[in-house]
């Protein structure tokens, strides 16, 4: 039997307002509203918390019966829909201990785990997975790309008691591995030996000058020489013009700086590699994954352009149940959501085309009127008379 610690689908109208608490840390936090957005698969089932004000911080949270994930799997799952074509904003959740003062939740409030998508400018389109380990927020060393389209997506984090993890988007694995390998929770296993230093006679030169090579005697020639073909101009007056000097040209026999040929260095020892030793600071921690207390799920975000919808929150200890729940919620409505969006896009295209056609028609009409105004006035005669008068149309 799976343990379901928290589940929120917003299926009871305004009932969510009694379960979710707004932070009062700042007076100008943005407001969440219940909405299924501009397009959806099922208007009722797809209702979720939507950010509604641009360029705002948001801080909202819901509490649940506190639990510890020691000795068991932890699964955190929710859906996010950036229907506003987001430019910069968070779509992540934070799991806090139950000691959090929900009315004072803010960006620096200490959390246990932060997970979910974050988009900001062209440089950030990633899924954050951050663990608070011994009081420090430790970021994952891998880059997990998030979805940046306008549709609803399902995000799942699985943390197992064997210190492994998995991240899924739309019920498909996008990343997995070991907590110790993919985060810097622990000091490195090996460090450079602080007592070792490169011996003074260590030769890192692969090539050296050939000591037997010597410069040829005829090597040194000047770079520039007087032009042998130059002649003093006939009108040159040494009293007036000074002593005539021929112009200088590049010496064809100039060989440049002589360098001895290079040979393999018989004393070459290669690049000195600093020897490593076991790090005395390192000790394994089999309980990296474990937290004594989870009690609050919070949305602590900044959004430049609002419109993101959060729905189908689930915290459980059962991976299969979470996958099933995802398929029964996001999985059921995703196709219809895309259909509705495609239909809206098609209607918009048609409307745009119609507007363009109307504009073109108006422009043609205006042009005709202008032409009539511009052309010279003609006498009002019948066609027959005009023809008899010999008029011809230009």
């Amino acid at each position: 039997e799976p343990a379901v610690y928290f589940k929120e689908q917003f299926l009871d109208g305004d009932g969510w307002t009694s379960r979710w608490i707004e932070s009062k840390h700042k007076s100008d936090f943005g407001k969440f509203v219940l909405s299924s957005g501009k397009f959806y698969g099922d208007e009722e089932k797809d209702k979720g918390l939507q950010t509604s004000q641009d360029a705002r911080f948001y801080a909202l949270s819901a509490s649940f019966e506190p639990f510890s994930n020691k000795g068991q799997t932890l699964v955190v799952q929710f859906t996010v829909k950036h229907e506003q074509n987001i430019d910069c904003g968070g779509g992540y959740v934070k799991l806090f201990p139950n000691s959090l003062d929900q009315t004072d939740m803010h960006g620096d409030s200490e959390y246990n785990i932060m997970f979910g998508p974050d988009i900001c400018g062209p440089g950030t389109k990633k899924v954050h997975v951050i663990f608070n380990y011994k009081g420090k927020n430790v970021l994952i060393n891998k880059d997990i790309r998030c979805k940046d389209d306008e549709f609803t997506h399902l995000y799942t984090l699985i943390v197992r008691p064997d210190n492994t993890y998995e991240v899924k988007i739309d019920n498909s694995q996008v990343e997995s591995g070991s907590l110790e390998d993919d985060w810097d929770f622990l000091p490195p296993k090996k460090i450079k030996d602080p007592d070792a230093s490169k011996p003074e006679d260590w030769d890192e030169r692969a090539k050296i000058d050939d000591p037997t090579d010597s410069k040829p005697e005829d090597w040194d020639k000047p770079e520039h020489i007087p032009d042998p073909d130059a002649k003093k101009p006939e009108d040159w007056d040494e009293e007036m013009d000074g002593e005539w000097e021929p112009p200088v040209i590049q010496n064809p026999e100039y060989k440049g700086e002589w360098k001895p040929r290079q040979i393999d260095n018989p004393d070459y020892k290669g690049t000195w590699i600093h020897p490593e030793i076991d790090n005395p600071e390192y000790s394994p921690d089999p309980s990296i994954y474990a937290y004594d207390n989870f009690g609050v799920l919070g949305l602590d975000l900044w959004q430049v352009k609002s419109g993101t919808i959060f729905d189908n929150f689930l915290i459980t200890n059962d991976e299969a149940y979470a996958e099933e729940f995802g398929n029964e919620t996001w999985g059921v409505t995703k196709a219809a959501e895309k259909q509705m969006k495609d239909k809206q896009d098609e209607e918009q295209r048609t409307r745009r085309m119609m507007r363009t056609k109307m504009r073109m028609r108006r422009m043609r009409r205006t042009r005709r009127k202008m032409r009539r105004k511009m052309s010279p006035a003609r006498p009002r005669t019948s066609c027959r008379e005009a023809c008899l008068q010999g008029w011809t149309e230009a």
């Epitope: 974050d118 400018g121 440089g123």
Partner: antibody
């Protein structure tokens, strides 16, 4: 990689204001946060505040609150720092520095340090 | 307000290991960055997030952070490493720098 070029040296009278500019090139301006750091002669580094151009909001060190204004113009990829009510203690080299923006939260870029710095602008306050 | 404390100066013989410390209350819970500054020049980031090296920074620079002390280690110190070094962290919604340490290579 982004490069930051700052405006030239300034000599100011006590009580006046100074506005230093920092133009970014070679990168997407909206992908960075810009901090302003000053260094008085023979002293250490002191953070004054910063701005994330894509947010449009600035964050200031308590010490400079009310006296410093940091702005950014995305169209010209330029950040500005204006310091008012100048006194002789404000004589310093003023640096702008950028941090890669790796997320939408204010604190995100501070996880990555300031990896590109301007050449510095010397501001001398003297009567 | 949060404070970071560095020794004013550290001396090291060429080829030896230099260690510069940065003390702060529970600094191990924060992300610490280190900057190198040579006379008349702008600072250069040499370590970020406690122990990560930006591209172009030699391998001899490393960092660690736990408890109340963060440490910048320069192994096989060279004459060119002589400079001022500053630690930096994010504390109480503000950026905080240490007072700086002058590293002298003997």
């Amino acid at each position: 990689e982004v490069q930051l070029v700052q405006s030239g040296a300034e000599v100011k009278k006590p009580g006046s204001s100074v506005k230093v500019s920092c133009k970014a090139s070679g990168g997407t301006f909206s992908s960075y946060a810009i901090s302003w750091v000053r260094q008085a002669p023979g002293q250490g580094l002191e953070w004054m505040g910063g701005i994330i151009p894509i947010f449009g909001t600035a964050n200031y060190a308590q010490k400079f609150q009310g006296r410093v204004t940091i702005t950014a113009d995305e169209s010209t990829s330029t950040a500005y720092m204006e310091l008012s009510s100048l006194r002789s203690e404000d004589t310093a080299v003023y640096y702008c520095a950028s941090s890669p923006l790796r997320g939408s939260g204010w604190y995100w870029h501070y996880y990555y340090g300031m990896d590109v710095w301007g050449q510095g602008t010397t501001v001398t306050v003297s009567s | 307000s949060y404070e970071l404390t560095q020794p004013p100066s550290v001396s090291v013989a060429p080829g030896k290991t230099a260690r510069i410390t940065c003390g702060g209350n529970k600094i191990g819970t924060k992300s610490v960055h280190w900057y190198q500054q040579k006379p008349g020049q702008a600072p250069v980031l040499v370590i970020y997030q406690d122990s990560k090296r930006p591209s172009g920074i030699p391998e001899r620079f490393s960092g660690s952070n736990s408890g109340n002390t963060a440490t910048l280690t320069i192994s096989g110190t060279q004459a060119m490493d002589e400079a001022d070094y500053y630690c930096q962290a994010w504390g109480s919604s503000t950026v905080v720098f240490g007072g700086g340490t002058k590293l002298t290579v003997l």
